[in-house]
Every structure is written in structure tokens, then in C-alpha cells.
């Protein structure tokens, strides 16, 4: 194992892979202020690159439910409500950490996993490739 | 502990709060293809609501480094490069899970925590409040 000075009050770990295997308390602490207005926004509808949200479920993952964004249009919505195909709606993606049951169906054993999720969409100027 | 039919190959847990406290392997499995172009995109520059990325560091958190988006403008960038203040650049926020060392400074004991991060920005039509 790795020589780490034992802090009094810290749980012990006899695991041979210590500290690669750790104890995690799943009682989630919420750091967010409950009144944060940005969390309850309707940007998905008001954006020039609007998106729909889809419920992605995986019972072997924690959290088992993740909402994924899918852009509604290839182009971006103009002030008159029409779609401008000279611009592109693209998903903003983020890598997030989830817990994956490992071995499968085990109730108390997980492995950290990085997954890529689409959080919303933004409107970008397309990259124009000029042919010589 | 709680009487649960033991799945062969599952680690044991004698923790009284089981299954709220679980074992987690920190050797991250990456589900994402490393060549995914969206992850290395320059949307932050090409967006009509461009953003800058700021490094948020916390040694008591896992991952210790999280990149946060901050919109560059209040308005949105038009085709001519000028900012249109009749539209708004707003951050797209997402709740993500991180591991927080608990008790503090303990190397092998964590608690799940939900934090709100800004992933990028999108351009939205403002909500106009009409005064009677």
C-alpha cells in the first residue's frame, strides 16, 4: 500500500489496493442553494439552439437516471422563428463521474466511471472547408 | 449487517449503514472514445454566446479540478462580430456528483456530493416583463 499518515478518526482500510478502493457514503450532500434561479430555467425552450431532454436509465449505474439533451434543429432559430441553416446547433458535452456496479448486481461495490453527457445546446458558426 | 443473499463474487460489507456506505474502486473506467471530436471542440470560441473556462480546484474533492464556464458577454455575438444586447448569453448548468473527503483530510473515506457547474453558454431570448 501507500504510506499515508493515519489521521485519528479516519476509517481504516486493509484493502490491498488501498487507496484505490475507498469507502463512499451515498447519502448525498447537496451544496447547491435551493433557490438558485438558473437551475429552474427554461433555457431549453428559449435558446436559439433549443433542445429536448431524454431520460437515460441504467439500473447498474449510480445515479440510475440521467437526463440527456438532444438539439432540436441542425440550424439555429432566428428572431422570426425560422431556422437559419448557415449556423449550427451543437450539443455542449461534459464528462461526468458516475458509479458503476462492479461486479454487476453487487449491492455495495462500485467502480468510478467517466461518461460523456450532453447538457444543452449552443449556436455556433460552422467551420467552412474551402476546396482548392 | 443486513441479511442479504450473498452474490458470489460480491465484496462483503459489515457497515451498519449498508447499503448507504459502499466500496468504490477509484481506477476510473472511461466509457468515452478518446477521439470524440466534441470533447476537444472549440465551441466556446465559435458560439454566439462564447465562454471562458476557469479552473476550480479543491484538494478535498475528487475530482480536485473542475473547469467552470463563464459567459463572455451579457448579449450574444452577431454575424458581424458585434454584440446584440436584445439577446442574452446564459450559462447552462448541470448538477454533477463528486466525492468529498469525509472526515476532512481522510485518504480513503468520502461522501457523495451534488454540485452545480456551468458547462457552457447558450443564447436565449430574454423574458420581457411588461409593466401595467
Amino acid at each position: 500500500g501507500i504510506a499515508i499518515p493515519r489521521n485519528s478518526g479516519c476509517p481504516n482500510s486493509e484493502d490491498k489496493n488501498f487507496p484505490r478502493t475507498v469507502m463512499v457514503n451515498l447519502n448525498i450532500h447537496n451544496r447547491n442553494t435551493s433557490t438558485n434561479p438558473k437551475r429552474s430555467s427554461d433555457y431549453y425552450n428559449r435558446s436559439t439552439s433549443p433542445w429536448n431532454l431524454h431520460r437515460n436509465e441504467d439500473p447498474e449505474r449510480y445515479p440510475s437516471v440521467i437526463w440527456e439533451a438532444k438539439c432540436r434543429h441542425l440550424g439555429c432559430v432566428k428572431a422570426d422563428g425560422n431556422v437559419d441553416y448557415h449556423m449550427n446547433s451543437v450539443p455542449i458535452q461534459q464528462e461526468i463521474l458516475v458509479l458503476r456496479r462492479e461486479p454487476r448486481h453487487c449491492p455495495n461495490s462500485f467502480r468510478l466511471e467517466k461518461i460523456l453527457v450532453s447538457v444543452g445546446c449552443t449556436c455556433v458558426t460552422p467551420i467552412v472547408h474551402h476546396v482548392a | 449487517g443486513i441479511a442479504i443473499p450473498r452474490n458470489s463474487g460480491c465484496p462483503n460489507s459489515e457497515d451498519k449503514n449498508f447499503p448507504r456506505t459502499v466500496m468504490v474502486n477509484l481506477n476510473i473506467h472511461n466509457r468515452n472514445t478518446s477521439t470524440n471530436p466534441k470533447r476537444s471542440s472549440d465551441y466556446y470560441n465559435r458560439s454566439t454566446s462564447p465562454w471562458n473556462l476557469h479552473r476550480n480546484e479543491d484538494p478535498e474533492r475528487y475530482p480536485s479540478v473542475i473547469w467552470e464556464a463563464k459567459c463572455r458577454h451579457l448579449g450574444c455575438v452577431k454575424a458581424d462580430g458585434n454584440v446584440d444586447y436584445h439577446m442574452n448569453s446564459v450559462p447552462i448548468q448541470q448538477e454533477i456528483l463528486v466525492l468529498r473527503r469525509e472526515p476532512r483530510h481522510c485518504p480513503n473515506s468520502f461522501r457523495l456530493e451534488k454540485i452545480l457547474v456551468s458547462v457552457g453558454c447558450t443564447c436565449v431570448t430574454p423574458i420581457v416583463h411588461h409593466v401595467a
Epitope: 429552474s40 425552450n45 429536448n52 | -
Partner: antibody, heavy 119, light 107 residues
């Protein structure tokens, strides 16, 4: 404390539509999913679908896809379920319930709305 | 979809008796099972989540156990106020499904 207050009993004619409501209080409405469930004496409890008021996303049980439409109004912290083309088969008690998306379980239920479809 | 078979449908017991209700899932649902108590004229109340975790404020006479497909709910010493319908629900995956319920009556 958390409460889900559902609208009162409804008596409607076959072929009509009805909109049931579920008003949330005691928590941030946008943070949690609201699910809807149908209860009949014959078939017991059946899951209809879910709406996430924070992001507008919905998902439905295929059996109810053409029957129910879920919406939410964040300004009044109220979730709605509209049932269309009603028949006697839709007569039931309908419940809303709150789902903790991260934790993965349902913790609070409404008191139920009794819908009777009859001519 | 996953079928949750709950037994028995009815229970007639005396105060002080021990009561056991079972739910069997048609496929493994890990420990993603909850038990609820539904009293007449009230909202259903969560008693047990994660198959065996007693929810906040629930008296310790209520217990749950099981993993995979077989789940048990027990009231160690029935009290008069426990008169209700009890049902299980799997929250392993949608469509979320329910047991048929057990009506508990006190002699």
C-alpha cells in the same frame, strides 16, 4: 414539510378530456421528477410516466403514450396530467409521486384524484 | 416489464402478532425495492427503501430484507394503527411496477 396536493374528484363524459393537477410545496419543485400512477381495483397500480419540471423532459410508459400528456408550471409549482379521449377504462384513482433522481426512489405521494368517466 | 408478485392479498391478525409479506420480482432488481403503507383517505407513505433501509421517522417494528428477486416486509409487533394496505414497488427501472397490495386487518 413536503406535500403533493392533488385536485378534486372529476366526473366526465366519454370522449372528453380532463386535466388533473398536483401542486408541490415544501421543496424546490424544479429539482425532482414528478411521476404519475393509475390505480384500479382490477389492475392495481400502473406507472404512467414522468416529467422533470426543471428541464421539461418527459418519459412515458408505452401503454399510456397516446392517453396522457404531462406538463409542469414552475411558477405555480404544479404538475399536470391531461388524459384524452376518455373511456370507462380510464376511470381510476390517479396519484402523483416525487422521485429523487439521484437517490433513485420515490418518497412522497399525493392523496390521489378519483376520475369517473360516465355518460 | 418487471412483474412484482405480492403475497398474501389479505391478513387478519391480532395486535401484538408478527406479520410477514413477500414480494417476488420476475427478474433481478438488485435492492431497488420500496415498501409503502396506504391508510384509507391518506397518501401512501414510504416505509422502506433500498429493500432494507428504514425511511426517516419510520418505527423500528417495520423491517425489510431481500436482494435480487425475493423481498420480505415484516411488522414485528402489529399495532392497531397499522391497519392499512401495504405494497411493494420496484424502482430498478421504468416502467416502475408494483405488487398487488396486502390488506392488513386487525381482529
Amino acid at each position: 414539510q413536503v406535500q403533493l396536493q392533488q385536485s378534486g374528484a372529476e366526473l366526465v363524459r366519454p370522449g372528453a378530456s380532463v386535466k388533473l393537477s398536483c401542486k408541490a410545496s415544501g421543496y424546490t419543485f424544479s429539482d425532482y421528477e414528478i411521476h404519475w400512477v393509475k390505480q384500479t381495483p382490477v389492475h392495481g397500480l400502473a406507472w404512467i410516466g414522468v416529467i422533470h419540471p426543471g428541464n421539461g423532459g418527459t418519459a412515458y410508459n408505452q401503454k399510456f403514450k397516446d392517453k396522457a400528456t404531462l406538463t409542469a408550471d414552475k411558477s405555480s409549482s404544479t404538475a399536470y396530467m391531461e388524459l384524452s379521449s376518455l373511456t370507462s377504462e380510464d376511470s381510476a384513482v390517479y396519484y402523483c409521486e416525487r422521485f429523487l433522481t439521484y437517490e433513485g426512489y420515490f418518497d412522497y405521494w399525493g392523496q390521489g384524484t378519483t376520475l369517473t368517466v360516465s355518460s | 416489464s418487471i412483474v412484482m408478485t405480492q403475497t398474501p392479498k389479505f391478513l387478519l391478525v391480532s395486535a401484538g402478532d408478527r406479520v410477514t409479506i413477500t414480494c417476488k420480482a420476475s427478474q433481478s432488481v438488485n435492492n431497488d425495492v420500496a415498501w409503502y403503507q396506504h391508510k384509507p383517505g391518506q397518501s401512501p407513505k414510504l416505509l422502506i427503501n433500498y429493500a432494507s433501509n428504514r425511511y426517516t421517522g419510520v418505527p423500528d417494528r417495520f423491517t425489510g430484507s431481500g436482494y435480487g428477486t425475493d423481498f420480505t416486509f415484516t411488522i414485528s409487533t402489529v399495532q392497531a394503527e397499522d391497519l392499512a394496505i401495504y405494497f411493494c414497488q420496484q424502482d430498478y427501472g421504468s416502467p416502475y411496477t408494483f405488487g398487488g397490495g396486502t390488506k392488513l386487518e386487525i381482529k
